[in-house]
Amino acid sequence: FERTRSLQDPCSNCPAGTFCDNNRNQICSPCPPNSFSSAGGQRTCDICRQCKGVFRTRKECSSTSNAECDCTPGFHCLGAGCSMCEQDCKQGQELTKKGCKDCCFGTFNDQKRGICRPWTNCSLDGKSVLVNGTKERDVVCGPSPADLSPGASSVTPPAPAREPGHSPQ
């Protein structure tokens, strides 16, 4: 099948880093400067991505693979292949159209990106709040209030009383 395909389509023989050049009677030609083809059989080479402005180069372009970008400090990647850079905020904040804003009471964000999320509602699981939440941290849920009441099974029973007149072993 491969042989049949190559006889029918000379372009199928062109390896990565080349393209099938219609201007040269469909012979394989190396990709021109600042372009690439990452697979064989291409009819054109793609222009290399340029990491400019808030983007910085994580991996240089080559004739067989595109450049890869990430974001300059203070920004983070969004989208497939880091198609966008979004401003970082501090923990306890979220990015709005007007910039970084503190999380509202009852919400938190423990990262430099993303939105403020509501504190966990411990009572939904029948638990109590062990540590209060902050803008940067979620609440920590503890045992249920019933577990803390006297006579509850989870409370450790007192040590048995020693008989009078007996010294410790």
Partner: nanobody, 111 residues
Framework: AVQLVESGGGLVQPGGSLRLSCAAS????????WSWYRQAPGKQRELVAW???????HYTDSAKGRFTISRDNTKKTLYLQMDSLKLEDTAVYYC?????WGQGTQVTVSS
């Protein structure tokens, strides 16, 4: 424009070696892609080996492991070292620098 002149072709037995040279003159400093092609009798010209614009050497399947492309920038010369030559390597070999072609040098592999 760039002028290219190939040399080093000849008659060689199967399993033998040849070293082709391609001397360049003119303004070569802006050229970043250098290639060797070949054309066998009755066949289409085909890419054999090349220096991509990122300075990495590449080879087509027919040349891998047997041919080595190199260059000497001070001498403005591109080379193709061909080892373990086979009958099917018989062709006219051409040097190419983006838009310029040499006149070719004949390589004949015959016992």
């Amino acid at each position: 424009a760039v002028q290219l002149v190939e040399s080093g072709g000849g008659l060689v037995q199967p399993g033998g070696s040849l070293r082709l040279s391609c001397a360049a003159s003119g303004n070569i400093f802006s050229i970043r892609v250098w290639s060797w092609y070949r054309q066998a009798p009755g066949k289409q010209r085909e890419l054999v080996a090349w220096f991509a614009w990122d300075n990495i050497a590449h080879y087509t399947d027919s040349a891998k492991g047997r041919f080595t492309i190199s260059r000497d920038n001070t001498k403005k010369t591109l080379y193709l070292q061909m080892d373990s030559l086979k009958l099917e390597d018989t062709a006219v070999y051409y040097c190419n620098s983006e838009d310029s072609w040499g006149q070719g040098t004949q390589v004949t592999v015959s016992s």
